[in-house]
C-alpha cells in the first residue's frame, strides 16, 4: 500500500512541478504535509535556477550530479540521495519524511554511522574479551598478545611460549628457565651468564670490591679475609672487617725500676762495663722474680775473656759457674726461687771464696784461690751482661745452659756502685720494663709466634704419626690461632684456633685442615679468670676430643678426606707454631689472627718450653703471664 502511495506522489510531482512549474502551495498539494513541502520547495527552486536556459550560477555546483531538471527534482524527496551516511560505517539508508535513517554495520554508531565503536572500552565486554591487548580499529577490533605469548585459535586468549622447550640448547651450558613472556638463562650462584658464549662464567666478586680488606675469588664464589696479623677479623656480614676486641682485659702496667730480662729472645738485655781500683772485688746484689726454671741472670767476664762468672738458674735454683786461671767450678744450691715472688739475691767475692745469699741467708760458699778477675795496670776492668751471653760461649761453659730467662730484677747494686745510671737508660726503653704483677704461664701478646720442630712420627705406633695435644688457655682476645702445623709448601694442614662466637660473650674453638673447619666446639666462655682445658688426639684415621664439650663436626666421609690431606702433610716436613701463623696466604686457614692471652701447650706428653723454641717473637713471654685487670672503685 505504501509503494502505491509513493508512486501516486511521484506522478503528481511529475505533472505539477516538472512538466509545469509549481508554486509552494501546489507543492503542498503533492506532499500533503508541511515538513516534506518545507524540505522540498527551497531545493526545487535551486534546481529551477540551475536548469533555466543560459543561467549558470554558483547553485549549479550542487546539482552537477543531475543531467536535467527531471533528475534534479525527482531526487529532492529521496533523503538518501546524495548519501548522508558514512560510507565506511553504514549498511543501508532508509528514506523518510524529510529525514533518513542510516543502519550501521557492526562496530559503528551515530546518526550517520560516522563514529567507530571502541569495543575495547565496552563495559559489558571488558577489554573486548581479550586476555591481553585489545586493538581498536575503524569499525572493528582485534586481540593481540604481548611478546613472548602466542595467540590461541579463539583469537582472544594468549598462551605463554615455552622458549626452553622450543630450543633445548637455548641457554647453552646454563639452565633455561621459562618465565611468563620470556625465558632466563640461569647460572649457579657465583656465576653470570655470558650471552656470547652461551655459558656460565665465574663472577669475579673481588673485582667488584665486595670485601673490605682481602678477597680470594674461586669458581662460583669468593671469600673475604681480614688481616688478622694487624688485629682484624671478619665481621658477621662476612665482608667487612672489625678489630679483634679484648674480651678479658689484662693488667699490663710496667715499672721502669723493674728490668725485664727476656726483652730479647736471644741476646743480652743490658751490658755494663766497670773500671774500678784494683782492690775492688766482684759483687752483685739484686731482687729477682721469675717462674722460669732455667736461664742466665748475669754473666761477668774480664776484658780479655780469660776469666768469667755465671750466675744462672737451673731447676729453679741458683747456679754459679766460674772459671779463671786458677780454677773452674760449678755449684747449684739453695731453695727453689722460681716461685714468682721477689727474692733478694747477693753474690759477693770474698778473699778466699764467693758467697751466695738468698734473702740475706747464705746458701752457697765457693772456695777460690786468688782473685776472680785479675787487675791490669792497677785497675779491675769487668764486663757484666744481664740475661745472656755476649757471644757463643757454650763450649767454654762447664755445663751448658739455655740462657733464655723470663724474669725481672730490681734494686740492683753491681760492684757496690749502686744503680749508677742504669735506671736512666732503662727508663727510656719501654720494652725493658717489667710487668708489675705476673702469674705463672706463657703470654702471647697478639703480635707474634713461636716456632718448634717436633717429630710426630712414632716408630712403635702402627698408626704412624700421632698428635696428642693439651691446651690450657686463658685468652684475652676472642679470636686467634693457638696452634698450627705448617708445611714447607706454605699450607696449614692442621690448626687449632679461637673465634668469637655468634652468641654474645662466648668463643668457639675451631680445628681446621687447610681452610676447612673439621671440628667446631661451640659457645664456650673462655674469656674468664679461669683457665680452660682442651685435650685432643689426632692420627691419620681419627680426631678424638678428650674434653667433654659440645661439638659440631663435618660428615664422616668429609672428615676422612680432610684427614687424608693431613696425613699426606705429616709424611713430609711440618713446623709447629704457637700463637699464630708465619707468612702464609690469608686463604690458607679460616683464622689468621695472632692469639692473645695466656697458654700452656703439651704435645705428645712434653710441656713446650718457649725458651726451647727455634724462634720466638720477643714480645711473647715464655714464663710469665699478666694478671687479669681488677677493676678498682675509682678506675
Amino acid at each position: 500500500a505504501n509503494s502505491m502511495l509513493e508512486e501516486t506522489k511521484q506522478g503528481n510531482l511529475e505533472r505539477e512541478c516538472i512538466e509545469e512549474l509549481c508554486n509552494k502551495e501546489e507543492a503542498r498539494e503533492v506532499f500533503e504535509n508541511d515538513p516534506e513541502t518545507d524540505y522540498f520547495y527551497p531545493k526545487y527552486l535551486v534546481c529551477l535556477r540551475s536548469f533555466q536556459s543560459g543561467l549558470f550560477t554558483a547553485a549549479r555546483q550542487s546539482t552537477d550530479a543531475y543531467p536535467d531538471l527531471r533528475s534534479c527534482v525527482n531526487a529532492i524527496p529521496d533523503q538518501c540521495s546524495p548519501l548522508p551516511c558514512n560510507e565506511d560505517g553504514y549498511m543501508s539508508c532508509k528514506d523518510g519524511k524529510a529525514s533518513f535513517t542510516c543502519t550501521c554495520k557492526p562496530g559503528w554508531q551515530g546518526e550517520k554511522c560516522e563514529f567507530d565503536i571502541n569495543e575495547c572500552k565496552d563495559p559489558s565486554n571488558i577489554n573486548g574479551g581479550c586476555s591481553q591487548i585489545c586493538d581498536n580499529t575503524p569499525g572493528s577490533y582485534h586481540c593481540s598478545c604481548k611478546s613472548g605469548f602466542v595467540m590461541l585459535s579463539n583469537k582472544k586468549d594468549c598462551k605463554d611460549v615455552d622458549e626452553c622447550s622450543l630450543k633445548p640448547n637455548m641457554c647453552g651450558t646454563a639452565v633455561c628457565k621459562n618465565i611468563p613472556g620470556d625465558f632466563e638463562c640461569e647460572c649457579p650462584e657465583g656465576y653470570r651468564y655470558n650471552l656470547k658464549s652461551k655459558s656460565c662464567e665465574d663472577v669475579d666478586e673481588c673485582s667488584e670490591n665486595m670485601c673490605a680488606q682481602l678477597c680470594v675469588n674461586y669458581p662460583g664464589g669468593y671469600t673475604c679475609y681480614c688481616d688478622g696479623k694487624k688485629g682484624f677479623k671478619l665481621a658477621q656480614d662476612q665482608k667487612s672487617c672489625e678489630a679483634v676486641s679484648v674480651c678479658l682485659p689484662l693488667n699490663l702496667d710496667t715499672k721502669y725500676e723493674l728490668l725485664y730480662l727476656a726483652e730479647q729472645f736471644a741476646g743480652v738485655v743490658l751490658y755494663l762495663k766497670f773500671r774500678l781500683p784494683e782492690i775492688s772485688r766482684f759483687s752483685a746484689e739484686f731482687d729477682f722474680r721469675t717462674y722460669d726454671s732455667q736461664g742466665v741472670i748475669l754473666y761477668a767476664e774480664s776484658i780479655d775473656h780469660s776469666a768469667w762468672l755465671l750466675i744462672a738458674l737451673r731447676g729453679g735454683k741458683i747456679e754459679v759457674q766460674l772459671k779463671n786461671e786458677h780454677t773452674s767450678k760449678i755449684t747449684t744450691g739453695g731453695d727453689i726461687i722460681n716461685n714468682g715472688l721477689w727474692n733478694m739475691v747477693s753474690v759477693e767475692e770474698l778473699e778466699h771464696s764467693i758467697s751466695i745469699k738468698i734473702a740475706k741467708e747464705a746458701v752457697m760458699d765457693i772456695n777460690k784461690p786468688g782473685p776472680l778477675f785479675k787487675p791490669e795496670n792497677g785497675l779491675l776492668e769487668t764486663k757484666v751482661y744481664f740475661a745472656g751471653f755476649p757471644r757463643k760461649v757454650e763450649s767454654e761453659l762447664i755445663k751448658p745452659i739455655n740462657p733464655r730467662l723470663d724474669g725481672c730484677i730490681r734494686s740492683w747494686n753491681l760492684m757496690k756502685q749502686g744503680a749508677s745510671g742504669i735506671k736512666e737508660i732503662i727508663q727510656e726503653k719501654q720494652n725493658k720494663h717489667c710487668l708489675v704483677t705476673v702469674e705463672k704461664g706463657s703470654y702471647y701478646p697478639g703480635s707474634g709466634i713461636a716456632e718448634f720442630h717436633i717429630d710426630y712420627n712414632n716408630g712403635s705406633n702402627a698408626e704412624g704419626w700421632h698428635i696428642n695435644v693439651t691446651l690450657n688457655i686463658r685468652p684475652s682476645m676472642g679470636t686467634g690461632v693457638m696452634l698450627a702445623l705448617v708445611s714447607s709448601n706454605n699450607t696449614v694442614p692442621f690448626a687449632v684456633s679461637l673465634v668469637d662466637s655468634t652468641s654474645e660473650k662466648s668463643q668457639d674453638i675451631v680445628i681446621s685442615v687447610e681452610n676447612t673447619v673439621i671440628y667446631r666446639i661451640q659457645a664456650l666462655s673462655l674469656c674468664s679468670n679461669q683457665r680452660s682445658h682442651l685435650e685432643f688426639r689426632v692420627n691419620r684415621n681419627n680426631l678424638e676430643l678428650l674434653t667433654p664439650l659440645k661439638i659440631e663436626t663435618i660428615s664422616q666421609e668429609e672428615l676422612q678426606t680432610q684427614l687424608a690431606i693431613l696425613d699426606k702433610a705429616m709424611k713430609g716436613k711440618v713446623a709447629t707454631y704457637l700463637g699464630g701463623l708465619p707468612d702464609v696466604p690469608f686463604s690458607a686457614t679460616p683464622v689468621n689472627a695472632f692469639y692473645n692471652g695466656c697458654m700452656e701447650v703439651n704435645i705428645n706428653g712434653v710441656e713446650l718450653d718457649l725458651d726451647e723454641a727455634i724462634s720466638k717473637h720477643n714480645d711473647i713471654r715464655a714464663h710469665s703471664c699478666p694478671s687479669v685487670w681488677k677493676k678498682t672503685k675509682n678506675s
Epitope: C145, S147, M151, S153, K159
Partner: antibody
Amino acid sequence: QVQLQESGPGLVKPSETLSLTCTVSGGSISNYYWNWIRQPPGKGLEWIGYIYYIGITDYNPSLKSRVTISVDTSKNQFSLKVTSVTAADTAVYYCAALSGDHAFDIWGQGTLVTVSS
Amino acid sequence: DIVMTQTPLSSPVTLGQPASISCRSSQSLVHSDGNTYLSWLQQRPGQPPRLLIYKISNRFSGVPDRFSGSGAGTDFTLKISRVEAEDVGVYYCMQATQFPHLTFGGGTKVEIK
C-alpha cells in the same frame, strides 16, 4: 586481522636457491609461530619449517640440510631459502601462522614456484 | 616422526547427506600438557587450506556447525552432518603434538555424487 602475502620468483633454475618472503600485516609478528608449507601439484601438504620471532627455528628433517628460515621483525617479514633445488621442489609454497593451539589459523594465498631450466 | 593416515582417499557424497573422514596417528597425540593437538583443514579447489577444527573438536571462527570433530589418543573423525556444494574439496588432518615437528595426513577428497 592478520593477513599473509607470499612473494618471490615463480621460476627457479635447478641447483639454484629458491627465495621467498612472507609479509605479515594487521598484527604483531610476535603473536604466532611462522611456518612454510608446500604442496606439489596434485599432491598433499608438506611442512617445511617454522620460525619464532626471536629467531628460534626448526625444520622438517627431510629438508633440514637445504632449508633456512629467517625473520626481520622491523619489516614484519619472514623468509624461506631452499638451496640446490630440483624439479621435485616445484610446488605451491604457502606461509601460515600457527597459533598457541598449534593450529594453522591463517594462510597466505600461496605462490607457485616452478623449478625448471 | 608421527605418521598420519587418512581414510578414505576419496568420499563421494550426496548433497544433504552426512560424510565422515577418519584419521589415525602412529602414536598417541596426547601432549604432556594434557591437550591433544589434532586439527582438520579444508582445501577447496584452487584455494589455500583453511582451518576447520582444532584440538580434536573445537570449531574455528566462521566454520559452520555442520562440521564436527571427535576422537582421542590415536583415532580421530571429522563429520559433515549435511554436505553442501561448497564443502567440495580435500580435507587434511594434522598433528602438532610433536611441535615443532608437524605432520599432515595424505588428504581425503570429498566430491558430490
